[in-house]
């Protein structure tokens, strides 16, 4: 039950995280004009990965895409790539994890296969979350670095003419959405990996075993206080090895007159 809950919760958390990564990637407000100590309040600029926008005091907002690669920072391309890789990995992870969910039955899929799929999706979510966090962090670092470089250039006279308008950009809402979404996807992935451990069937045969003789004798179950007969239908229709020894999973005991407490 705990395994199913952990897996289900991991899936939901990752789903929310990936939705957040997609939202952050599409948002225009990656960098927004810092209005602190800025005399120009007639316009408000904000810039995204794909286009930049201007909101004027009249309320009119105009957005226009970057229809060129020329003049765009190389870091922007890296951020775009990281976010897209994160989305793609996350989407594949979601697809895999749907089939891996314990609560969903697909044919006669073995638990070991579900465990492997859960682990695969978990790793994909972790990498997806890390890509998003890395992308957002690279962008944030670019904003800060560029700001200090531009400030230094202005004071050392490298900026050329006195600027018409001194605008500075600060962290936009998309950065915070991206950080949170990446974190959620990461946490969801870790939960899926934890759930995988609970789903994986044990390799060792150290389960409690019920030994029975061929007659109507009473068998002792180690670790329990209840004795049971050797009778019981082998509902899983599995061949019983070890001279008639059955694991608790393989035998289904029904109450009978031979049961003693």
């Amino acid at each position: 039950m705990a395994v199913t809950a952990c897996q289900g919760l991991g899936f939901v958390v990752s789903l929310i995280g990936i939705a957040g990564i997609i939202a952050a990637t599409c948002m225009d407000q990656w960098s927004t004009q810092d209005l602190y100590n800025n005399p120009v309040t007639a316009v408000f600029n904000y810039q995204g990965l794909w286009r930049s926008c201007v909101r004027e005091s009249s309320g009119f907002t105009e957005c226009r895409g970057y229809f060129t690669l020329l003049g765009l920072p190389a870091m922007l391309q890296a951020v775009r790539a990281l976010m897209i890789v994160g989305i793609v990995l996350g989407a594949i992870g979601l697809l895999v994890s749907i089939f891996a969910l314990k609560c969903i039955r697909i044919g006669s899929m073995e638990d070991s296969a579900k465990a492997n799929m859960t682990l695969t999706s978990g790793i994909m979510f972790i990498v997806s979350g890390l890509c998003a966090i890395a992308g957002v962090s690279v962008f944030a670092n670019m904003l800060v670095t560029n700001f200090w470089m531009s400030t230094a250039n202005m004071y050392t006279g490298m900026g050329g003419m006195v600027q018409t308008v001194q605008t500075r950009y600060t962290f936009g809402a998309a950065l915070f959405v991206g950080w949170v979404a990446g974190g959620l996807t990461l946490i969801g992935g870790v939960m899926m990996c934890i759930a995988c451990r609970g789903l994986a069937p044990e390799e060792t045969n150290y389960k409690a075993v019920s030994y029975h003789a061929s007659g109507h004798s009473v068998a002792y179950k180690p670790g329990g206080f209840k004795a049971s007969t050797g009778f019981g239908s082998n509902t899983k229709n599995k061949k019983i090895y070890d001279g008639g020894a059955r694991t608790e999973d393989e035998v289904q005991s029904y109450p009978s007159k031979h049961d003693y407490v």
């Epitope: 960098s31 004027e56 005091s57 226009r64 003049g71 962008f139 560029n146 531009s150 900026g159 308008v165």
Partner: nanobody, 119 residues
Framework: AVQLVDSGGGLVQAGGSLRLSCAAS????????MAWYRQAPGNQRELVAT???????NYADSVKGRFTISRDNAKNTVYLQMNTLKPEDTAVYYC?????????????WGQGTQVTVSS
């Protein structure tokens, strides 16, 4: 890098009109600040007009009411419509693009176009 090509200058009588054009390639972003400067012989380069966004404009006191700055995003072009020209408007006019992309500041200049107003 952005290339700016200024055009539209020439010789005009006082009271006449001229329209200067500044074509940018490869593109103008909406957050770019477009401006026109002018430099008369022996003087420093002075700011004439600025354009932020689509219609947020600012003009030097000497040209207010006579000059109009505008842009056509589809053509990646900025214009300076100059009406009621005076002899003191004689100068070389330069187009300027001030770009701040993610705090990376760049300034681009046109080659300049000569405007001569005769009395």
């Amino acid at each position: 890098a952005v290339q700016l090509v200024d055009s539209g200058g020439g010789l005009v009588q006082a009271g006449g009109s001229l329209r200067l054009s500044c074509a940018a390639s490869p593109t103008i972003f909406v957050t770019d600040v477009m401006a026109w400067y002018r430099q008369a012989p022996g003087n420093q380069r002075e700011l004439v007009a600025t354009l932020l966004g689509r219609s947020t404009t600012n003009y030097a006191d000497s040209v207010k009411g006579r000059f109009t700055i505008s842009r056509d995003n589809a053509k990646n072009t900025v214009y300076l419509q100059m009406n009621t020209l005076k002899p003191e408007d004689t100068a070389v006019y330069y187009c300027n693009l001030h770009r701040n992309l993610f705090n990376k500041i760049d300034n681009y200049w046109g080659q300049g176009t000569q405007v001569t107003v005769s009395s």
